[in-house]
């Protein structure tokens, strides 16, 4: 009797179990009672990444420099091109279809994690004892200056945006 289900890497058509085309190849003709499935390799700018019965290969992704994209990994007949962003930019989505500039951490915030081609800058508030007085995509929160180690005293307290101001110790005592 004709099969109702087929083995792995096969598909059912016209009561026949036909072999799927291997990754990197597209379907030209289904198998028959007397012939095998016929497949053809994808062209240079195309790919198929699974065992398939597709009659057309997929176009490789284009890494558009106008969108800040560049090729991270060139596609093959079995894999798509992987795009990443140019220096100073990161992807707007997992599929990396466009890029935006890295975020800068405002004064009072420091860089917790520097941005990559696929992830934005992660900022964190400067905790007590640390500050950042610049807007930067690289700078971490810096510790307040320790006046004591310089044999100085705090003349003006630090904030999350400013360092302490040290001054000489007052030698006149009551």
């Amino acid at each position: 009797e004709p099969p109702t289900a087929c083995r792995e890497k096969q598909y059912l058509i016209n009561s026949q179990c036909c072999s799927l085309c291997q990754p990197g190849q597209k379907l030209v003709s289904d198998c028959t009672e007397f012939t095998e499935t016929e497949c053809l390799p994808c062209s240079e700018s195309e790919f198929l990444d699974t065992w398939n019965r597709e009659t057309r290969c997929h176009q490789h992704k284009y890494c558009d420099p106008n969108l800040g994209l560049q090729v991270q990994q060139k596609g093959t007949s079995e894999t798509d091109t992987i795009c990443t962003c140019e220096e100073g930019l990161h992807c707007t989505s997992e599929s990396c279809e466009s890029c935006v500039p890295h975020r800068s951490c405002l004064p009072g915030f420091g860089v917790k994690q520097i941005a990559t081609g696929v992830s934005d800058t992660i900022c964190e508030p400067c905790p007590v004892g640390f500050f950042s007085n610049v807007s930067s995509a690289f700078e971490k929160c810096r510790p307040w200056t320790s006046c004591e180690t310089k044999d100085l005293v705090v003349q003006q307290a630090g904030t999350n945006k400013t360092d302490v101001v040290c001054g000489p110790q007052d030698r006149q005592r009551a």
């Epitope: 072999s19 003709s29 028959t32 009672e33 007397f34 012939t35 095998e36």
Partner: antibody, heavy 112, light 112 residues
Framework: EVQLQESGPGLVKPSETLSLTCTVS?????????WNWIRQPPGKGLEWMGY???????NYNPSLKNRITISRDTSKNQFSLKLSSVTAADTAVYYC?????WGQGTTVTVSS | DAVMTQTPLSLSVTPGQPASISCRSS???????????LNWYLQKPGQSPQLLIY???NRFSGVPDRFSGSGSGTDFTLKISRVEAEDVGVYYC?????????FGQGTKLEIK
Amino acid sequence: EVQLQESGPGLVKPSETLSLTCTVSGYSITSNYYWNWIRQPPGKGLEWMGYIRYDGSNNYNPSLKNRITISRDTSKNQFSLKLSSVTAADTAVYYCARLDYWGQGTTVTVSS
Amino acid sequence: DAVMTQTPLSLSVTPGQPASISCRSSQSLENTNGNTFLNWYLQKPGQSPQLLIYRVSNRFSGVPDRFSGSGSGTDFTLKISRVEAEDVGVYYCLQVTHVPFTFGQGTKLEIK
């Protein structure tokens, strides 16, 4: 239902060219399958002569050397056999077939 | 070429009794995908061959289940579990794994 029907002269003179046509109904010859010519000399077994594929490419039996040509007319859904330089040994019933469906066969006699 | 040898060349069977025909190939008919393209045909007197079995063991549509095919590699068998009067004719195996396609020489089945 797929149907095949052979047509052509029943008598061919020695050294001339045998020409037969197979008309297919119920299925397009460009869709899939290999479209074959098979012959059977009187009182003998079956001999595969060659095929034309759905894409128009061919394969022939080497025993027929360079005498055989199979072509097609997709507008009429027909494929044809030409066998040149025939001799009495080419007298046979000629079948066109998709291998699951066959024509009823046409008898060709080679005689002067 | 794959030479196909059928045995016996003729057999006479009482209705209701089983029959078995062997077909042996000079080379393996299994292709690189592990598929084997061997067909069995019955040619009744004065008719075109009709497909019984394809791919070794698959019955073609409308073929009674008393016909079964088996085998692998180079050795294949057609079995008729209970022969009926309408089964008379010549049985042929045909391999379509390798070009040129080749038929066995035929086995004539008669009713006792």
